[in-house]
Interface confidence: low
Amino acid sequence: CEEPPTFEAMELIGKPKPYYEIGERVDYKCKKGYFYIPPLATHTICDRNHTWLPVSDDACYRETCPYIRDPLNGQAVPANGTYEFGYQMHFICNEGYYLIGEEILYCELKGSVAIWSGKPPICEKVLCTPPPKIKNGKHTFSEVEVFEYLDAVTYSCDPAPGPDPFSLIGESTIYCGDNSVWSRAAPECKVVKCRFPVVENGKQISGFGKKFYYKATVMFECDKGFYLDGSDTIVCDSNSTWDPPVPKCLKVLPPSSTKPPALSHSVSTSSTTKSPASSASGPRPTYKPPVSNYPGYPKPEEGILDSLD
């Protein structure tokens, strides 16, 4: 027989020879870091057909590292479910806690003993410092100095000194997030007031009022013989401007060979409309506008346009 087989967990006793006689026996021992559990054989014999009789290193077991209990508010997860040397222990904290220390420990061999590569980490509670104070406003729990994971505060605006109130711009409620950072920026309190929206040849059909504050919404329609250039719905935004801009009501041109046909009915609807000149952020059109020679518009069929798709 040629040299006997080699194994991960056991090694030959004595030096290997270039060849062995039939019937010659070789013995193995468990390698450093492995220990023997009977009764499996750890020897083999050179057989008549010049091969070694079957033998395995299944009797040699890896040394294991000491048991590690789960950290408080977390988990210790052995890779491959084993504590044997050469493997790793992974540490995960529960939601609302973060890891202090090594996320992974290695089970390592020191001499013939298996020990962990370091100290197990701990799981600390996620804490946030107080959220930012805002001008012209305040938040709940302003007296609290330390906030825990998912603790929430709600902002509100102070009464305004003048005739117009402060509006809250942004989300009113924020919470302590899992990386000890508040879930979003604090909102803003400021006076937001949009100018009275005037549309010539048209009229306001909703959102009536004398003053238009943050998020005030107004809808328009055009008088008979006029069509809407822009959005029929506008909202007062945080910069005290209308978004999209205040629309216009343009006159429907009379029919001719190069001009679109006049409509026999008023082109106005409470559903949203949009022309090529209107803001791209506005709502989508729900009817075909009566202009065939503007870029991007469909040509009228047989001189008649339906007011609705």
Partner: antibody, heavy 116, light 109 residues
């Protein structure tokens, strides 16, 4: 200056062997896990092997297990990759890299071409 | 085929924001193992960009950020610049094996 300087690449026939070296400066390799990562021409990164900081633990990708051996010489502050029974599909740029879970320092890479 | 799945390519104009996704499974990212990101500029070695899901090594601009949820992770790049054109790889771990995504080529238009 903290760096990894690689050597040992070249053209080799299938079935032959080659040894790559990666010399560290500015830090000692026996304080860190060290890896080999490869990149076939025009392809993505593939992890090859790792050796733990004390040299006791070595892991290999299935594609190289039994053919490649990772080792280090602490006296020379150098990492090695012994590549035996090379195949055409082992053709790649081989990078050595420092670190455990992630690789925060990379060598410049050395090209290994396996061709008859 | 990579165990971690990335889109082969993404693109964006200068100044824009782009995100690159990385999808794993319950045995790697979903098991709680960290996700790391590498940038590889043409003809150079990879460079660590994000480690431990969302940490930046010193010298990496804060335009780069990482996040992770469930079995997926993503890299976000804001204020895109011409020099960001490169290949980006996500990386994670499963017992005894370090994993890479297939890589995503970022083109700055």
């Amino acid at each position: 200056q903290v760096q990894l300087v690689q050597s040992g690449g070249g053209v080799v026939q299938p079935g032959r062997s080659l040894r790559l070296a990666c010399a560290a400066s500015g830090f000692t390799v026996n304080n860190y896990a060290m890896h080999w990562v490869r990149q076939a021409p025009g392809k993505g990164l593939e992890w090859v092997a790792v050796i733990s900081y004390d040299g006791n633990n070595k892991y290999y990708a299935d594609s190289v297990k039994g053919r490649f051996t990772i080792s280090r010489d602490n006296s020379k502050n150098t990492l090695y990759l012994q590549m035996n029974s090379l195949r055409a599909e082992d053709t790649a740029v081989y990078y050595c890299a420092k670190g455990g879970g992630y690789f925060d320092l990379w060598g410049r890479g050395t090209l290994v071409t396996v061709s008859s | 085929q990579s165990v971690l799945t990335q889109p082969p390519s993404v693109s964006g104009a200068p100044g824009q924001r782009v995100t690159i996704s990385c999808t794993g499974s319950s045995s790697n990212i979903g098991a709680g193992y960290d996700v790391h990101w590498y940038q590889q500029l043409p003809g150079t070695a990879p460079k660590l960009l994000i480690y431990g899901d969302n940490n930046r090594p010193s010298g990496v601009p804060d335009r780069f950020s990482g996040s992770k949820s469930g079995t997926s992770a993503s890299l976000a790049i804001t204020g895109l610049q011409a020099e960001d054109e490169a290949d980006y790889y996500c990386s994670s771990y499963t017992s005894g094996t370090w994993l890479f995504g297939g890589g995503t080529k970022l083109t700055v238009l």
